[in-house]
Amino acid sequence: LSVQQGPNLLQVRQGSQATLVCQVDQATAWERLRVKWTKDGAILCQPYITNGSLSLGVCGPQGRLSWQAPSHLTLQLDPVSLNHSGAYVCWAAVEIPELEEAEGNITRLFVDPDDPTQNRNRIASFPG
Protein backbone atom coordinates (compact mmCIF):
# COMPACT_ATOMS: atom_id res chain seq x y z
CA LEU A 1 0.00 0.00 0.00
CA SER A 2 1.38 3.43 -0.90
CA VAL A 3 0.09 6.98 -0.80
CA GLN A 4 1.27 9.92 -2.88
CA GLN A 5 0.00 13.34 -1.93
CA GLY A 6 0.12 16.78 -3.46
CA PRO A 7 0.76 19.60 -3.61
CA ASN A 8 3.60 20.03 -1.14
CA LEU A 9 2.69 23.66 -0.68
CA LEU A 10 -0.57 25.44 -1.36
CA GLN A 11 -1.13 29.15 -0.85
CA VAL A 12 -4.67 30.46 -1.38
CA ARG A 13 -6.73 33.53 -0.64
CA GLN A 14 -9.33 33.44 2.11
CA GLY A 15 -12.77 32.73 0.65
CA SER A 16 -11.40 30.86 -2.35
CA GLN A 17 -11.06 27.09 -2.86
CA ALA A 18 -8.23 24.69 -2.01
CA THR A 19 -7.86 21.20 -3.46
CA LEU A 20 -5.64 18.52 -1.94
CA VAL A 21 -5.09 15.32 -3.89
CA CYS A 22 -4.07 11.88 -2.74
CA GLN A 23 -3.27 8.83 -4.88
CA VAL A 24 -3.63 5.44 -3.20
CA ASP A 25 -1.93 2.45 -4.81
CA GLN A 26 -2.43 -1.10 -3.59
CA ALA A 27 -0.69 -4.10 -5.12
CA THR A 28 -3.41 -6.55 -4.14
CA ALA A 29 -7.15 -6.10 -4.50
CA TRP A 30 -8.99 -4.69 -1.50
CA GLU A 31 -12.61 -5.08 -0.53
CA ARG A 32 -12.75 -2.12 1.79
CA LEU A 33 -10.24 0.70 2.03
CA ARG A 34 -10.16 3.20 4.85
CA VAL A 35 -8.92 6.66 4.01
CA LYS A 36 -8.12 9.49 6.38
CA TRP A 37 -7.21 13.15 6.25
CA THR A 38 -5.50 14.78 9.19
CA LYS A 39 -4.74 18.42 9.88
CA ASP A 40 -1.94 19.26 12.32
CA GLY A 41 -2.11 15.72 13.71
CA ALA A 42 -5.87 15.68 14.34
CA ILE A 43 -8.22 13.53 12.29
CA LEU A 44 -10.65 15.39 10.03
CA CYS A 45 -12.42 12.28 8.72
CA GLN A 46 -11.69 8.60 8.10
CA PRO A 47 -14.41 7.08 5.93
CA TYR A 48 -14.46 3.79 4.05
CA ILE A 49 -14.36 3.14 0.34
CA THR A 50 -16.34 0.01 -0.49
CA ASN A 51 -16.87 -1.23 -4.05
CA GLY A 52 -15.47 2.06 -5.33
CA SER A 53 -17.97 4.08 -3.34
CA LEU A 54 -17.10 6.59 -0.62
CA SER A 55 -19.17 6.26 2.54
CA LEU A 56 -18.93 9.89 3.58
CA GLY A 57 -18.68 13.11 1.60
CA VAL A 58 -17.96 15.58 4.39
CA CYS A 59 -14.48 15.99 5.83
CA GLY A 60 -13.85 18.63 8.47
CA PRO A 61 -15.13 22.22 8.33
CA GLN A 62 -16.10 23.18 4.76
CA GLY A 63 -14.37 20.03 3.51
CA ARG A 64 -15.76 17.84 0.74
CA LEU A 65 -14.32 14.45 -0.07
CA SER A 66 -14.49 12.67 -3.41
CA TRP A 67 -13.10 9.39 -4.74
CA GLN A 68 -12.28 8.81 -8.38
CA ALA A 69 -11.66 5.13 -9.09
CA PRO A 70 -9.27 3.46 -9.12
CA SER A 71 -7.04 5.51 -6.87
CA HIS A 72 -7.68 9.24 -6.52
CA LEU A 73 -8.95 10.85 -3.33
CA THR A 74 -9.61 14.59 -3.31
CA LEU A 75 -10.23 16.91 -0.37
CA GLN A 76 -11.77 20.19 -1.42
CA LEU A 77 -11.97 23.07 1.05
CA ASP A 78 -14.50 25.66 -0.07
CA PRO A 79 -14.70 28.39 1.04
CA VAL A 80 -11.27 28.50 2.65
CA SER A 81 -10.98 30.34 5.96
CA LEU A 82 -7.87 31.47 7.84
CA ASN A 83 -8.10 28.57 10.29
CA HIS A 84 -7.78 26.10 7.41
CA SER A 85 -4.06 26.93 7.42
CA GLY A 86 -1.97 23.97 8.54
CA ALA A 87 -0.29 20.70 7.67
CA TYR A 88 -2.50 18.11 5.96
CA VAL A 89 -1.70 14.43 5.60
CA CYS A 90 -3.58 11.77 3.67
CA TRP A 91 -3.57 8.22 5.04
CA ALA A 92 -4.91 4.93 3.76
CA ALA A 93 -5.41 1.60 5.50
CA VAL A 94 -6.67 -1.85 4.68
CA GLU A 95 -8.00 -3.22 7.99
CA ILE A 96 -9.07 -6.71 6.94
CA PRO A 97 -7.71 -9.40 6.83
CA GLU A 98 -4.49 -7.76 8.06
CA LEU A 99 -3.79 -4.16 8.88
CA GLU A 100 -1.75 -2.29 6.32
CA GLU A 101 -1.21 1.46 6.61
CA ALA A 102 0.39 4.12 4.46
CA GLU A 103 0.65 7.87 4.72
CA GLY A 104 1.35 10.65 2.26
CA ASN A 105 3.74 13.55 2.59
CA ILE A 106 2.59 16.76 4.19
CA THR A 107 0.70 19.40 2.24
CA ARG A 108 1.23 22.78 3.88
CA LEU A 109 -1.72 25.07 3.29
CA PHE A 110 -1.27 28.80 3.77
CA VAL A 111 -4.33 31.01 3.68
CA ASP A 112 -3.87 34.72 2.99
CA PRO A 113 -6.35 37.21 4.45
CA ASP A 114 -8.80 38.60 1.93
CA ASP A 115 -7.02 41.92 1.55
CA PRO A 116 -8.07 43.76 -1.62
CA THR A 117 -4.95 45.96 -1.47
CA GLN A 118 -2.82 42.89 -2.14
CA ASN A 119 -2.94 41.16 -5.49
CA ARG A 120 -1.27 37.87 -4.66
CA ASN A 121 -1.70 34.87 -6.94
CA ARG A 122 -2.38 31.32 -5.83
CA ILE A 123 0.79 29.25 -5.42
CA ALA A 124 0.85 25.49 -5.72
CA SER A 125 3.97 23.36 -5.58
CA PHE A 126 3.82 19.68 -6.52
CA PRO A 127 6.49 17.06 -5.79
CA GLY A 128 8.92 16.00 -8.47
Partner: antibody, heavy 118, light 107 residues
Framework: QVQLVQSGAEVKKPGSSVKVSCKAS????????INWVRQAPGQGLEWMGW????????NYNEKFKGRVTITADKSTSTAYMELSSLRSEDTAVYYC???????????WGQGTTVTVSS | DIQMTQSPSSLSASVGDRVTITCRAS??????LNWYQQKPGKVPKLLIY???RLHSGVPSRFSGSGSGTDFTLTISSLQPEDVATYYC?????????FGGGTKVEIK
Amino acid sequence: QVQLVQSGAEVKKPGSSVKVSCKASGYTFTSYDINWVRQAPGQGLEWMGWIYPGEGSTNYNEKFKGRVTITADKSTSTAYMELSSLRSEDTAVYYCARRGLRYYFDYWGQGTTVTVSS
Amino acid sequence: DIQMTQSPSSLSASVGDRVTITCRASQDIRNYLNWYQQKPGKVPKLLIYYTSRLHSGVPSRFSGSGSGTDFTLTISSLQPEDVATYYCQQVNTLPWTFGGGTKVEIK
Protein backbone atom coordinates in the same frame (compact mmCIF):
# COMPACT_ATOMS: atom_id res chain seq x y z
CA GLN B 1 -9.13 18.34 26.90
CA VAL B 2 -10.38 14.99 25.61
CA GLN B 3 -12.78 13.27 27.99
CA LEU B 4 -14.89 10.12 27.80
CA VAL B 5 -17.49 9.93 30.57
CA GLN B 6 -19.38 6.67 31.03
CA SER B 7 -22.70 5.88 32.66
CA GLY B 8 -22.95 4.43 36.16
CA ALA B 9 -22.75 0.87 37.49
CA GLU B 10 -25.46 -1.62 36.60
CA VAL B 11 -26.78 -4.80 38.23
CA LYS B 12 -28.60 -7.09 35.82
CA LYS B 13 -30.34 -10.44 35.82
CA PRO B 14 -29.13 -13.29 33.62
CA GLY B 15 -30.85 -13.20 30.23
CA SER B 16 -31.43 -9.46 30.32
CA SER B 17 -29.64 -6.65 28.45
CA VAL B 18 -27.49 -3.72 29.48
CA LYS B 19 -26.79 -0.48 27.64
CA VAL B 20 -23.71 1.52 28.64
CA SER B 21 -23.14 5.06 27.43
CA CYS B 22 -19.93 6.99 26.74
CA LYS B 23 -20.15 10.77 26.31
CA ALA B 24 -17.23 12.35 24.48
CA SER B 25 -15.98 15.92 24.75
CA GLY B 26 -12.89 17.94 23.88
CA TYR B 27 -12.57 16.70 20.28
CA THR B 28 -14.60 16.17 17.12
CA PHE B 29 -16.68 13.12 18.01
CA THR B 30 -17.46 12.19 14.40
CA SER B 31 -13.79 11.95 13.41
CA TYR B 32 -12.52 9.19 15.69
CA ASP B 33 -13.49 5.56 16.28
CA ILE B 34 -14.88 4.62 19.67
CA ASN B 35 -13.95 1.13 20.84
CA TRP B 36 -15.36 -0.96 23.67
CA VAL B 37 -13.13 -3.11 25.85
CA ARG B 38 -14.10 -5.16 28.88
CA GLN B 39 -12.21 -6.47 31.87
CA ALA B 40 -13.61 -9.27 34.05
CA PRO B 41 -12.68 -9.15 37.76
CA GLY B 42 -8.97 -9.88 38.17
CA GLN B 43 -8.64 -10.60 34.45
CA GLY B 44 -7.11 -9.05 31.37
CA LEU B 45 -8.58 -6.85 28.65
CA GLU B 46 -10.89 -8.03 25.87
CA TRP B 47 -11.75 -5.98 22.79
CA MET B 48 -15.44 -6.05 21.85
CA GLY B 49 -15.78 -3.82 18.83
CA TRP B 50 -15.74 -0.28 17.46
CA ILE B 51 -17.93 2.31 15.82
CA TYR B 52 -16.96 5.15 13.50
CA PRO B 53 -19.51 7.80 14.54
CA GLY B 54 -18.97 9.81 11.36
CA GLU B 55 -20.98 7.27 9.40
CA GLY B 56 -22.12 4.69 11.95
CA SER B 57 -20.02 1.84 10.55
CA THR B 58 -19.14 -0.87 13.06
CA ASN B 59 -16.79 -3.80 13.49
CA TYR B 60 -17.36 -6.46 16.14
CA ASN B 61 -15.36 -9.21 17.76
CA GLU B 62 -16.94 -12.43 16.44
CA LYS B 63 -17.09 -13.71 20.02
CA PHE B 64 -19.80 -11.13 20.76
CA LYS B 65 -21.53 -11.03 17.37
CA GLY B 66 -25.27 -11.21 17.72
CA ARG B 67 -25.10 -10.15 21.37
CA VAL B 68 -23.39 -6.76 21.16
CA THR B 69 -24.63 -3.64 19.40
CA ILE B 70 -22.58 -0.45 19.28
CA THR B 71 -24.31 2.76 18.26
CA ALA B 72 -23.55 6.48 18.33
CA ASP B 73 -25.62 9.63 18.62
CA LYS B 74 -23.84 12.46 16.83
CA SER B 75 -26.15 15.11 18.28
CA THR B 76 -25.02 14.34 21.84
CA SER B 77 -21.50 13.02 21.05
CA THR B 78 -22.39 9.80 22.83
CA ALA B 79 -21.54 6.19 21.97
CA TYR B 80 -23.48 3.23 23.33
CA MET B 81 -22.72 -0.42 23.84
CA GLU B 82 -25.62 -2.79 24.36
CA LEU B 83 -24.97 -6.39 25.41
CA SER B 84 -27.89 -8.81 25.41
CA SER B 85 -28.54 -12.32 26.76
CA LEU B 86 -26.38 -11.54 29.76
CA ARG B 87 -24.74 -14.34 31.72
CA SER B 88 -22.64 -14.34 34.88
CA GLU B 89 -19.41 -14.41 32.81
CA ASP B 90 -20.35 -10.96 31.47
CA THR B 91 -19.72 -9.47 34.90
CA ALA B 92 -16.92 -7.01 34.15
CA VAL B 93 -15.83 -3.41 33.92
CA TYR B 94 -16.71 -2.08 30.46
CA TYR B 95 -14.55 0.69 29.00
CA CYS B 96 -15.01 2.91 25.99
CA ALA B 97 -11.76 4.03 24.39
CA ARG B 98 -10.96 6.37 21.54
CA ARG B 99 -8.72 5.09 18.78
CA GLY B 100 -6.06 7.68 18.12
CA LEU B 101 -4.34 8.82 14.97
CA ARG B 102 -3.11 5.29 14.35
CA TYR B 103 -4.27 1.94 15.67
CA TYR B 104 -4.05 2.41 19.43
CA PHE B 105 -6.36 3.58 22.21
CA ASP B 106 -5.24 6.98 23.45
CA TYR B 107 -8.13 7.99 25.72
CA TRP B 108 -10.29 5.77 27.92
CA GLY B 109 -13.54 6.26 29.81
CA GLN B 110 -13.52 5.70 33.56
CA GLY B 111 -15.22 2.31 33.18
CA THR B 112 -18.70 1.02 33.98
CA THR B 113 -19.11 -1.96 36.28
CA VAL B 114 -21.78 -4.39 35.10
CA THR B 115 -22.71 -7.16 37.52
CA VAL B 116 -24.82 -10.06 36.28
CA SER B 117 -26.40 -11.93 39.14
CA SER B 118 -29.64 -13.73 39.84
CA ASP C 1 -7.67 -15.32 16.88
CA ILE C 2 -4.10 -14.31 17.60
CA GLN C 3 -3.00 -15.31 21.10
CA MET C 4 -0.75 -12.91 22.98
CA THR C 5 1.34 -14.47 25.73
CA GLN C 6 3.11 -12.29 28.26
CA SER C 7 5.90 -13.31 30.58
CA PRO C 8 6.44 -13.22 33.41
CA SER C 9 2.90 -12.94 34.76
CA SER C 10 4.31 -11.04 37.73
CA LEU C 11 7.66 -9.74 38.91
CA SER C 12 9.15 -7.92 41.84
CA ALA C 13 12.12 -5.60 41.41
CA SER C 14 13.92 -2.86 43.30
CA VAL C 15 13.72 0.85 42.57
CA GLY C 16 16.31 1.67 39.92
CA ASP C 17 16.33 -1.83 38.44
CA ARG C 18 16.03 -2.49 34.73
CA VAL C 19 12.80 -4.39 34.11
CA THR C 20 11.97 -6.37 30.95
CA ILE C 21 8.56 -7.75 30.03
CA THR C 22 8.09 -9.95 26.99
CA CYS C 23 5.08 -10.51 24.77
CA ARG C 24 4.83 -13.30 22.21
CA ALA C 25 2.24 -13.46 19.43
CA SER C 26 0.95 -16.78 18.12
CA GLN C 27 1.59 -15.55 14.57
CA ASP C 28 3.41 -12.73 12.80
CA ILE C 29 1.95 -9.32 13.69
CA ARG C 30 4.82 -7.31 12.12
CA ASN C 31 5.10 -4.14 14.23
CA TYR C 32 1.45 -3.66 15.11
CA LEU C 33 1.92 -3.97 18.85
CA ASN C 34 0.92 -1.55 21.63
CA TRP C 35 1.69 -1.48 25.35
CA TYR C 36 -0.63 -0.19 28.09
CA GLN C 37 -0.10 0.45 31.78
CA GLN C 38 -2.91 -0.08 34.29
CA LYS C 39 -2.34 1.07 37.83
CA PRO C 40 -4.38 -0.58 40.60
CA GLY C 41 -8.00 0.56 40.45
CA LYS C 42 -7.30 2.84 37.46
CA VAL C 43 -7.98 2.98 33.73
CA PRO C 44 -5.42 1.58 31.22
CA LYS C 45 -3.04 4.17 29.76
CA LEU C 46 -1.22 3.97 26.44
CA LEU C 47 2.56 3.80 26.81
CA ILE C 48 3.92 2.65 23.46
CA TYR C 49 2.39 2.10 20.03
CA TYR C 50 3.67 0.52 16.84
CA THR C 51 6.20 -1.52 18.88
CA SER C 52 8.54 1.30 19.83
CA ARG C 53 6.91 4.72 19.55
CA LEU C 54 6.48 6.47 22.87
CA HIS C 55 3.09 8.06 23.42
CA SER C 56 3.17 11.74 24.32
CA GLY C 57 3.84 12.42 27.99
CA VAL C 58 5.27 8.95 28.70
CA PRO C 59 8.64 9.01 30.52
CA SER C 60 11.65 8.07 28.40
CA ARG C 61 12.59 5.24 30.79
CA PHE C 62 9.94 3.20 28.94
CA SER C 63 10.94 1.68 25.62
CA GLY C 64 9.69 -1.02 23.30
CA SER C 65 11.31 -3.29 20.75
CA GLY C 66 10.75 -6.38 18.65
CA SER C 67 9.00 -7.42 15.47
CA GLY C 68 7.15 -10.40 14.04
CA THR C 69 6.21 -12.51 17.04
CA ASP C 70 8.52 -11.43 19.86
CA PHE C 71 8.30 -8.09 21.62
CA THR C 72 9.77 -6.44 24.70
CA LEU C 73 8.80 -3.61 27.00
CA THR C 74 11.71 -2.26 29.03
CA ILE C 75 11.70 0.06 32.02
CA SER C 76 15.29 1.25 32.22
CA SER C 77 15.11 2.38 35.86
CA LEU C 78 12.08 1.24 37.83
CA GLN C 79 10.31 3.96 39.83
CA PRO C 80 7.72 3.55 42.62
CA GLU C 81 5.03 5.03 40.35
CA ASP C 82 5.61 2.23 37.82
CA VAL C 83 3.81 -0.28 40.06
CA ALA C 84 1.07 -1.48 37.70
CA THR C 85 -0.05 -4.25 35.38
CA TYR C 86 1.26 -3.97 31.82
CA TYR C 87 -0.63 -5.29 28.81
CA CYS C 88 0.45 -5.80 25.22
CA GLN C 89 -2.09 -5.54 22.41
CA GLN C 90 -1.89 -6.63 18.78
CA VAL C 91 -3.79 -4.64 16.15
CA ASN C 92 -2.47 -6.49 13.12
CA THR C 93 -5.45 -8.79 12.72
CA LEU C 94 -9.05 -8.58 13.87
CA PRO C 95 -10.16 -9.32 16.50
CA TRP C 96 -7.60 -7.21 18.31
CA THR C 97 -6.28 -9.12 21.30
CA PHE C 98 -4.43 -8.36 24.53
CA GLY C 99 -1.87 -10.29 26.51
CA GLY C 100 -2.80 -11.60 29.94
CA GLY C 101 -0.83 -8.88 31.69
CA THR C 102 2.36 -8.61 33.75
CA LYS C 103 2.06 -7.31 37.28
CA VAL C 104 5.07 -5.25 38.39
CA GLU C 105 5.73 -4.72 42.08
CA ILE C 106 8.50 -3.07 44.11
CA LYS C 107 10.67 -5.25 46.34
